[in-house]
């Protein structure tokens, strides 16, 4: 806390400008009006304030808005956002995607901080669902964002938003998350033709059931081994050798390199040796 002291004569701030960088902390506290600061927040980022000075500015805003900052202030916080705690952010009501983008920009290039996680949580909860524009924005800043959500949170993603998802956005998703996302993707892409459909659905197939894999095996899709390795073990086990051969097409030879790894190992173990021998890969059940 900065001690309350009277502002020295002639030092009262008329606007937020570079002259303030020469003010001591107590002078900032005494001479900068909180309401002025709030209306001119957009100027703060252009001024090279020290961390200590930013602490004072934050303190002034906290006093002015004890129930939480209005969005007009939040949108222009800039680097002052880095001074906010998750507890501060929980008081906010952020509804504008532009505000969200502005604050994410401040943290760009860094891992998702607790502050950013809280901000996103508040924003998404306020919207009621993870719409396409929000998902586009979040995955642009944090490619792993989608996979950081719980299956329960993912259930609020409407199928229409799935169009915004890129393959790399799903890299770190686990089976429980893909179990939720796959049916949404299937719904979103249902009107596409065979080859186009496979291109779009491929990265979601870690949530596909056996019957869908069997159907794909009849469509000459030539699934690559990287995709096959991400399939659910329980979905792969019932596939016959012939079905796996059709599913993988020319990539079937890659099974040999993966024979010690799941789910290939689990599948091999449950096949008849005679059937495996038809592949000519030397796989041992």
């Amino acid at each position: 806390e900065v001690e309350k002291t009277a502002c020295p004569s002639g030092k009262k701030a008329r606007e937020i400008d570079e002259s303030l960088i020469f003010y001591k902390k107590w002078e900032l506290e005494a001479c900068v009006d909180a309401a002025l600061l709030a209306t001119q927040m957009d100027r703060v980022n252009a001024i090279p304030f020290t961390y200590e000075q930013l602490d004072v500015l934050k303190h002034k805003l906290d006093e002015l808005y004890p129930q939480g900052y209005p969005e007009s202030v939040i949108q222009h916080l800039g680097y002052l956002f880095l001074k906010m705690s998750p507890e501060d952010i929980r008081k906010w009501n952020v509804t504008s995607l532009e505000t969200l983008k502005a604050l994410l920009e401040v943290n760009k290039g860094h891992e998702m901080s607790p502050q950013v996680a809280t901000l996103i949580d508040r924003f998404v909860k306020g919207r009621g669902q993870l719409d396409k524009d929000t998902l586009d924005t979040l995955t642009a800043f944090y490619p792993g964002y989608l996979c950081s959500l719980s299956p329960e949170e993912l259930s609020s993603v409407p199928p229409s938003s799935i169009w915004a998802v890129r393959p790399q956005d799903l890299d770190t998703c686990d089976p429980r998350q893909l179990d939720v996302l796959y049916p949404k993707a299937r719904l979103a892409f249902q009107n596409m033709n065979g080859s186009e459909y496979f291109v779009k659905i491929q990265s979601f197939l870690g949530g596909a059931p056996t019957e869908d894999l069997k159907a794909l095996s009849q469509q000459n899709v030539s699934m690559d081994l990287a995709t096959f390795m991400k399939l659910r073990t329980d979905a792969v086990l019932p596939l016959t050798v012939a079905e796996v051969q059709k599913l993988l097409g020319p990539h079937v030879e890659g099974l040999k390199a993966e024979e010690r790894h799941r789910p290939v190992r689990d599948w091999i173990l449950r096949q008849r040796q005679d059937d495996l021998d038809t592949l000519g890969l030397g796989l041992q059940g």
């Epitope: 429980r176 991400k230 073990t233 086990l237 799941r262």
Partner: antibody, heavy 119, light 107 residues
């Protein structure tokens, strides 16, 4: 409810073969989804996987023990067994049998049996 | 073989504390990592499978996360019955391997 029970001698002489059997009750050793493993734990130390068997007879062993280990299955008795040859004092441990359910992990364990290698 | 390195090897904590144990694989194990709890003189008990799935009957204060090479077991609020040794295990490669264990002791 599947239960596992290890049995076998608690004392084995150096250079001899350690033999243990695990009896499966409340379920079948021929289950499609299950592998049957042996795991050991030397006194005061961590867990070491020895190997597994599928009801078809397919096996897989820890490379560090492979030359000395044989795991077999007897579907008629609903049992699987471990043989570890040329034992030394370093093989003294609690030996556990466990079910490896394909969709999870070692979800059911025997209570363990202490085997001491000493002359 | 995939080596599993657990840290810390031991920790002291109080009832109600949030406890985090990490496990690092020497190469990718995808999400095929399980966590076990073992109490003295007892067989291990499966807590978490496939990195983040809670085994049936295990309290929800236990959670797992991670994929690839880095995995975490978290106990959100430590209870008296949670003082035990915890092990991670990978089953991605055919040669299963366990971490060295983390002993959680009372502070």
């Amino acid at each position: 409810q599947v239960q596992l029970q290890e049995s076998g001698p608690g004392l084995v002489k150096p250079s001899e073969t350690l033999s243990l059997t695990c009896t499966v009750s409340g379920g079948s050793v021929s289950s499609y989804h299950d592998l049957w493993s042996w795991i050991r734990q030397p006194p005061g130390k961590g867990l070491e996987w020895i190997g597994y068997i599928y009801y078809s007879g397919s096996t897989n062993y820890n490379p560090s023990l492979k030359s000395r280990v044989t795991i077999s299955v007897d579907t008629s008795k609903n049992q699987f067994s471990l043989k570890l040859s040329s034992v030394t004092a370093a093989d003294t441990a609690v030996y556990y049998c466990a079910r490896d359910f394909v969709l999870s992990g070692f979800d059911i364990w025997g209570q363990g049996t202490m085997v001491t290698v000493s002359s | 073989d995939i080596q599993m390195t657990q840290s810390p090897s031991s920790l002291s904590a109080s009832v109600g504390d949030r406890v985090t144990i990490t496990c690092r694989a020497s190469q990718s194990s995808r999400y095929y990592v399980n966590w076990y709890q073992q109490k003295p003189g007892k067989a291990p008990k499966l807590l978490i499978y496939a990195a983040s799935s809670l085994q049936s009957g295990v309290p929800s204060r236990f959670s797992g996360s991670g994929s690839g090479t880095d995995f975490t077991l978290t106990i959100s609020s430590l209870q008296p019955e949670d003082f035990a040794t915890y092990y991670c295990q990978q089953s991605y490669d055919a040669s299963y391997t366990f971490g060295g264990g983390t002993k959680v002791e009372i502070k």
